[in-house]
Each structure stands twice: as C-alpha cells, then as structure tokens.
C-alpha cells in the first residue's frame, strides 16, 4: 500500500482511485468499473465496433488503436482539409479522388478509365477484354480462336490487335461485289492460268487447282535434272535434244560435230526459238550430208545405221519443235538440197498438200492430232537428197508372200544385187506420233531420175530394224502409177519414204507384179 493512499497493484492501462481501487484508463474497460483485485485486466475498447457510438461519417473508415481510434478517408477518397485523421463526422472532409485524371495511363493500353466513387474501372475498347488475373489490363480478344467462327468458309480469319479480318485464302479472290477483309467477305478460286497470274516457266503448261495452280512439262518435255514435275517452279527441257545423240559404236568426227551442234542448240532452247532451231538443225544436217567426211569410210552397214538414226531422230526433233511454232506454212531449203515444208494449224477438217521440188505429200488433216492433245496440229515433210549417200546398197526386204510370188513369176533379182534409189529420201511426220496405221492413206508423188527399161519401180519406206539399223520395205505402201520420171505412192503409215528401182528382169508388164506392188 502506498502511504499516500494509492494502490500499487493496478493492472496495465489503469490508474489508482485510492489505496484499494483502480479504474481503467480512457479507451479501456474492465468487467466492473472499479477494479479491486489485481487479477482484473483493462481491455482496449474497440470504438469502431458496430455498436459503438463513434461515427466517422461517409467515405471514411474507422481505425481502432490501443486506447483510442482514428477516422481516415476510405481508399479512393481524400480529406479536403488535408488532415490525415479525424475523430468524428463533423471533422470529416472526405471526398472522391478522380484516379483517371490523376493518372491517365492507369488503364494501360486498349482501355478507357472510368472514375467511380472511391475507385475507377477500366472499360476495354472493342475487340479487347479484361484480363482475369489483372482486371485493370485489357488484352486482345482472338476472334479467330474464340469459337465464334466470324468468317465465311472460303476465307481465313486473321486476328489483329483489337480486331480481325476475313481474308481470301491464297489463290482465291473476292466474288464480284464482295469486299476483302470485313466479316462479310466471300471468296472464289482464282484461275491463275487463264488470268495470267501464274509464274509457270515457258517450258511448262499451267494447270489450275483449287486455291492454287501447278506447272506441268509440255508434251515432249521432261523436268530438268533434279526438279520435280507439277510444281510452281517446275522447269522442263525438250526431250528431243537429250535423246538425239550419236548412235553407239559409231566413231565419226563429222557425225560427232553434227550432234555437238544439236546439243548446243538444245542447251539454251526456249519455245520461242523453235523456228530458228529447226532451221539450224536442218542447216547442220544439210552440211553433214553434203560433206559426210569420215562417214563415207564406215562399213556400209554402219552407214545404214547412221542414216536410220538420223531419220528417226530428225522426225522426233522436228515433231517436238514444230509444236512450238505459230500457225501457218513454212518452207525452208538448203544448199545441198535438204528441204522442209511444214504446216501448223489449229485442228481443221480438210486435206493438206505439202509441195516440194521433188515430192508432194497429200493427207487428211484429222490424222495429225492425237485426241486430247491440246497443242496445234502439225504436218511436215522433209526431203533429204543427201541421205542417199548413206543409204547406198541398203537392202530391200519384201514380205514373204510378195517374195514367193516374185520367185514364181520372175527370175528374181539379177546378180548385181541392191536396188537403186531413184528419188530423194523424204521423211513425213505429224504432231501425232502414232502413225503406224492411218485411218486414211497418205499419197506421195515423187519426181525422180529416169527409169531404166525393164526395171521394176517400187514405193518403199525405211523400216528401222531391231538392231538400230534398218532396211527398205514395202509393207503398207503401194505404187499407184509410174511414168518415166515420176511415181505416185500410197501408204497407210508414216516414216521415211523413197522410190527404188529393183533389178528384176521384167520381160513385159506383169499383171501379178503390178498387183503386188
């Protein structure tokens, strides 16, 4: 006990009343107003509790403190007076803070700040939405993946920031009257081939596909080494050049030089160069046959092989090249007598006649084109007088039936053997290479050297043998009529042709032989 009458055992947060009693300090309370035993305690009064008489007023919050309390403005509000705390409603000067004005970038990009009492909200621009994890951040709505399918099936959806577009797919274009971009866009396939929007090389033909196109090698062309066919970047080369090379086993410098020229012409060949290339090949052939050089020293059989190879290859090359010519009639002649006549037309329904110095050919146009071939129709005739040098002493092989009949009615071939070539060798070709069985025959009128009396004149063609060489044959060809210096032949196939004079000892005009030939 304190001698002055104040209890020394008062609990924390209390003061003594007298020597035997204590009272809790303001802001604290105990079970009874007067504390008489040291076991009692003073507890903080929560002035902010609901039943409290304290009222801070609107836009404010009550904050309890040890033994007291403070009124403060709620978040988003601030006191006009500037005082951070106050004790009652009468001192309250809280008013709303305009956060949007205070910090214009509060809503970051793509959002508009909207002030609210005590706070603000972010309103996203069209095409944006609030990010769930950060409700103040607007992010782009991907309309293309949101399952809304906002675009027509002929278009593809392109998401962009805050928006989207419905764009025509590559190789498609808006249908007439349709925009290209808005959600009402409707597209259709572009025909790049007919519209000229393709990038096909001139060695290829353009084929339209849905939404795209491809480039295929022209007929008679093949993809360049290592480049696939039917691609946008396909580049092709003319097969005729790559396959026309010297025959195996023949060693001739003159012939090698000829084929070097052919390969040179093929190396940088383009369809537009067809006319010049044809002329250059025939010029080279004309020179080769005018001056055969070491070809003349080859054994006869090898010479026949070379001739066979030249005739066969020339026909293929001319057929391939002439498909790239424009419509019309072409005639070329060369110093040693080589002559080319060519007619190129879109399919026409009439007969065609090609006239040359020593030969005339007549046939039906509709033979020229293979059905389904989109190219032009070509009919060609080449006279190659120089080929006679290489075909000297070439054998004539008759069909067994003709051979038998001749043996029965004649003494057969005289001892001096091989038939004599009376005419120029001519080669006929069409754009259609299937000419083994023509639906209507072709007629040739040959001008030639005089026929020796009592000799038989035969219309023949060169048959390329299995061994790559060949021989004269008469199958499918008949002699319609012959005069001293001209003969008319009719054949049911195309190849290389000539008129031969066979050394038969013909006593008089034989009706059987006439029928046979």
């Amino acid at each position: 006990q304190d001698s002055r009458g104040c209890a020394r055992w008062c609990p924390q947060d209390s003061s003594c009343v007298n020597a035997t009693a204590c009272r809790c300090n303001p802001g604290f309370s105990s079970f009874s107003e007067i504390i008489t035993t040291p076991m009692e305690t003073c507890d903080d009064i929560n002035e902010c509790a609901t039943l409290s008489k304290v009222s801070c007023g609107k836009f404010s919050d009550c904050w309890n403190t040890e033994g007291s309390y403070d009124c403060v403005c709620s978040p988003g509000y601030e006191p006009v007076s500037g005082a951070k705390t106050f004790k009652n409603e009468s001192e309250n000067t809280c008013q709303d803070v305009d956060e949007c004005q205070q910090n214009p970038r509060l809503c970051k990009s793509y959002g508009t700040c909207v002030n609210t009492l005590g706070s603000y909200t972010c309103q996203c621009l069209p095409g944006f939405k609030l990010k769930p994890e950060d409700p103040k951040l607007c992010t782009d709505v991907n309309e293309c993946t949101s399952g809304q399918n906002p675009c027509h099936s002929s278009t593809h959806c392109l998401n962009n920031v805050g928006s989207y577009q419905c764009r025509c797919r590559p190789g498609w274009q808006p249908i007439p009257g349709s925009p290209n971009g808005p959600n009402n866009t409707v597209c259709e396939d572009v025909d790049e081939c007919s519209s000229g929007q393709h990038q096909c090389d001139s060695s290829t033909v353009c084929f339209n596909t849905v939404g795209s196109y491809s480039c295929r090698c022209r007929p008679g062309w093949k993809p360049r080494h290592g480049i696939p066919n039917n691609q946008k970047d396909t580049v092709c080369e003319d097969m005729t050049f790559s396959t026309w090379t010297p025959p195996p086993g023949v060693h001739s410098q003159t012939l090698s030089r000829f084929f070097d020229k052919v390969q040179d012409l093929g190396r940088d060949y383009k369809p537009g160069l067809a006319n010049n290339t044809i002329q250059s090949i025939l010029q080279a052939l004309d020179e080769l046959l005018e001056a055969p050089g070491d070809l003349e020293t080859l054994p006869r059989l090898q010479q026949h092989c070379v001739a066979s190879h030249l005739l066969d290859g020339l026909e293929d090359v001319l057929r391939g090249l002439s498909k790239n010519l424009s419509n019309g009639l072409l005639n070329f002649s060369y110093p040693a007598g080589t002559e080319l006549s060519l007619e190129v037309q879109k399919q026409v329904d009439r007969s065609v006649t090609l006239r040359q110095n020593q030969a005339v050919m007549q046939l039906d146009w509709n033979q020229a084109q293979k059905s389904g071939d989109p190219g032009p129709s070509v009919v060609g005739l080449v006279s190659i007088p120089g080929m006679g040098k290489l075909l000297a002493e070439a054998p004539l092989v008759l069909e067994p039936e003709k051979q038998m009949l001749l043996h029965e009615t004649h003494q057969g071939l005289l001892q001096d053997g091989s038939p004599i070539l009376l005419s120029d060798v001519i080669s006929a070709f069409l754009s259609n290479n299937d000419t083994q069985n023509l639906s209507s025959p072709v007629t040739f009128t040959f001008s030639h050297r005089s026929v020796i009396p009592r000799q038989k004149v035969l219309c023949v063609f060169w048959e390329h043998g299995q061994n790559g060489c060949g021989h004269w044959a008469t199958t499918g060809c008949s002699t319609i009529g012959t005069r001293d210096t001209s003969t008319i032949c009719r054949c049911t196939h195309l190849s290389s042709f000539a008129v031969l004079m066979a050394h038969y000892d013909v006593q008089e005009e034989d009706p059987v032989l006439t029928v046979i030939t």
């Epitope: 001139s202 070097d260 190396r267 369809p271 010049n276 290339t277």
Partner: antibody
Framework: QVQLVQSGAEVAKPGASVKLSCKAS????????MQWIKQAPGQGLEWIGA????????RHTQKFKGKATLTADKSTSTAYMEVSSLRSEDTAVYYC???????????WGQGTTVTVSS | EIVLTQSPATMSASPGERVTMSCSAS?????MHWYQQKSGQSPKRWIY???KLASGVPARFSGSGSGTDYTFTISSMEPEDFATYYC?????????FGGGTKLEIK
C-alpha cells in the same frame, strides 16, 4: 528492219546503280536471247549475260552475278540491265545484242557509255 | 569456261595482202562466230557458224575450222578491212569472246 536502240550515256558516283535500256524493234522480241556485253576503254569484248524475253530466264557469267540484273519487258520489247555498287572499273561502253546459238549476235545496239566518277 | 585465244594480238598488213588469224579454244566448240569492230563503233557480226558470211560481207572474207582450231582469212586486204576482229563461242555457258586481233596498216 531490226533495230536495237540503247539509252543515253550515264555518269554515276561510286556505290550508285544505273539501269540501262535496250529497245528492240523489227522482229519478234521472244525469238532471240538478248545479250549484254561490256567493253572497257581500250579493252576487248566481255560477255555479261543474256536474258530470254519470253520467260525472263537469264544466263550470267560468274563475275557479273549479283552485279548485273537482267530483265525484259515483253509489252514494250525492251531489255534492261541494272548495274549496282558501281566502281571505277565499271566505266565502260555496254552493248546489247540479239543472239542465237547458231547465228551469233547478228544485231547490236549503239552502246551506252557509263562513267563512274566521284 | 571455254577460253578463246586469238593470235596474233596485233598484225600489220598492206592492201592486197592475204591475211590469216586464228582462234584457239580450250575445249571443242561447234559454233564459232567472228565480229569486226572499228574504233568508236559497235561490233558487227562478220562470219557466223564457222564459215557463213554475214549479210553484206564481201566474199574475200572466209572462215574455217572445227573442234578447237578456227581460222579467219582475208584473201586480199582492202583499206576498209583494217579493224579489230573478235571470235566468239556459245557452245557452253558462259559465252566467251577471244581477246581480239587488231589489224593495222603496214
């Protein structure tokens, strides 16, 4: 008759580019390659390359790859050569010529003089 | 690339004289062409495909050869023939020219 008319003389600074033209007339533009040839002062003829006007295909000598760009415009029958990153060694007369393997270069333009000087 | 070597590089001749120049190729060539160029002028095609005279070229000019060796001949020099002559091939890419033979008046 066949004619190849080239653009006028050019003076350019080092590093710049020039685009020369060659207008063809009197023949079918797509029936021949268009050749470009350089002749430096007092020197011989040097092939740069060729363009085929029918499809824009080009051939170049290695030395001029990336240096000379060859193009052709079928609609105007004009061939072009752009020479880039010019240096003093590019000072020369540049010719265009119509060419075909078997015939050589049968018609030539009058030439365009390019002078590279700082 | 095929290198074309022309010889001689320069030669002198008098009018009426026969002149021969050669062009040697590092590999076989099948199409050889020759051009004439006078000072300040564009080249002119003179002989093509080894031996064919270009339009307007006088018959005193001739060409021959095959493989790697080619010859250009003027049977009887005329004053207007003094010029530089170039050979050229396109048998393989790149196309190449010879260095030229300059024909001067003696």
């Amino acid at each position: 008759q066949v004619q190849l008319v080239q653009s006028g003389a050019e003076v350019a600074k080092p590093g710049a580019s020039v685009k020369l033209s060659c207008k063809a007339s009197g023949y079918t533009f797509t029936n021949y390659w268009m050749q470009w040839i350089k002749q430096a002062p007092g020197q011989g003829l040097e092939w740069i390359g060729a363009v085929y006007p029918g499809d824009g295909d080009t051939r170049h000598t290695q030395k001029f790859k990336g240096k000379a760009t060859l193009t052709a415009d079928k609609s105007t029958s004009t061939a072009y050569m752009e020479v880039s990153s010019l240096r003093s060694e590019d000072t020369a007369v540049y010719y265009c010529a119509r060419g075909f393997t078997a015939y050589g270069m049968d018609y030539w333009g009058q030439g365009t003089t390019v002078t590279v000087s700082s | 690339e095929i290198v074309l070597t022309q010889s001689p590089a320069t030669m002198s001749a008098s009018p009426g004289e026969r002149v021969t120049m050669s062009c040697s190729a590092s590999s076989s060539v099948s199409y050889m062409h020759w051009y004439q160029q006078k000072s300040g002028q564009s080249p002119k095609r003179w002989i093509y495909d080894t031996s064919k005279l270009a339009s307007g070229v006088p018959a005193r000019f001739s060409g021959s050869g095959s493989g790697t060796d080619y010859t250009f001949t003027i049977s009887s020099m005329e004053p207007e023939d003094f010029a530089t002559y170039y050979c050229q091939q396109w048998s393989s890419n790149p196309l190449t020219f010879g260095g030229g033979t300059k024909l001067e008046i003696k």
